[in-house]
């Protein structure tokens, strides 16, 4: 048992937040400031990511985990771990190779990122358009045209309100 343990890599005992220091006879040393090790048994600590410029700190670096960044207002994250910040557009627009462009008629975008999407086609579900779409909003589909035939009400009227202890007049 002793022989097996002596053959074992002494660095494997170093926990996250430390590194196996070859300069100090392979003892476990804490990661220096602004560095981290997220797993045990590491021979070096990694440098913490710095969130600068357009990048804001979402989570501070610790001895066991890297910093996490997001984007300043007016931009949104792209890529793994927010490696880039893409410019926002206004609602009703999409970002093209030439910049922010208004959504074409029949399409909408209700966010500051992403692409313009076609309005819902209400007739595919046998419904009618209750509220027209805009560049910023999808159409609102209502009941089917058959439900709106003369004499038919599309909305059930509410029951008359009664106060407790009073009979209807």
């Amino acid at each position: 048992f002793e022989r097996t343990r002596s053959l074992q890599d002494p660095c494997s005992n170093c926990p996250a937040g430390t590194f196996c220091d070859n300069n100090r006879n392979q003892i476990c040393s804490p990661c220096p400031p602004n560095s981290f090790s997220s797993a045990g048994g590491q021979r070096t600590c990694d440098i913490c990511r710095q969130c600068k410029g357009v990048f804001r700190t979402r989570k501070e670096c610790s001895s066991t985990s890297n910093a996490e960044c997001d984007c300043t207002p007016g931009f949104h994250c792209l890529g793994a771990g927010c490696s880039m910040c893409e410019q926002d557009c206004k609602q009703g627009q999409e970002l093209t190779k030439k910049g922010c462009k208004d959504c074409c008629f029949g399409t909408f975008n209700d966010q500051k990122r992403g692409i313009c999407r076609p309005w819902t086609n209400c007739s595919l579900d046998g419904k009618s358009v209750l509220v027209n779409g805009t560049k910023e909003r999808d159409v609102v589909c209502g009941p089917s045209p058959a439900d709106l035939s003369p004499g038919a009400s599309s909305v059930t009227p509410p029951a008359p309100a009664r106060e407790p202890g009073h009979s209807p007049q």
Epitope: V54, S83, M84, E86, Q87, L95, K98, G99
Partner: nanobody, 124 residues
């Protein structure tokens, strides 16, 4: 092909000013964010400033805030760095760099094109 050519560097006394220029060609300049990065003698690359494609959003390294101003002229395909109140620690080679995606600001290790650099020396 993409080309970035810096100019405007030189020797200046502490407290003095310089204006760096970066002339861009070979891509649609007005669609890309641009940066200034510097490398002091014996040191690694240090991000200095970013400007978005339209020029309305600018960002600075803390040590240059209030002293340096990044700007761009999309009609002239040129990026600028106005450097005021220069200090000896601003001595470095200054590079302009292009970001990889349209209307997007990336981290320094993702920049896809760099100029050859211009030397700025601040000394009395």
């Amino acid at each position: 092909q993409v080309q970035l050519v810096e100019s405007g560097g030189g020797l200046v006394q502490p407290g003095g000013s310089l204006r760096l220029s970066c002339s861009a060609s070979g891509f649609t300049f007005s669609s890309y964010a641009m940066s200034w990065v510097r490398q002091a003698p014996g040191k690694g690359l240090e991000w200095v400033s970013d400007i978005n494609s339209g020029g309305e959003s600018t960002f600075y390294e803390d040590s240059v805030k209030g002293r340096f101003t990044i700007s761009r002229d999309n009609a002239k395909n040129t990026l600028y760095l106005q450097m005021n109140s220069l200090k000896p620690e601003d001595t470095a080679v200054y590079y302009c760099a292009k970001h990889p995606l349209t209307f997007t600001i990336a981290t320094m290790n993702d920049y896809d094109y760099w100029g050859q650099g211009t030397q700025v020396t601040v000394s009395s």
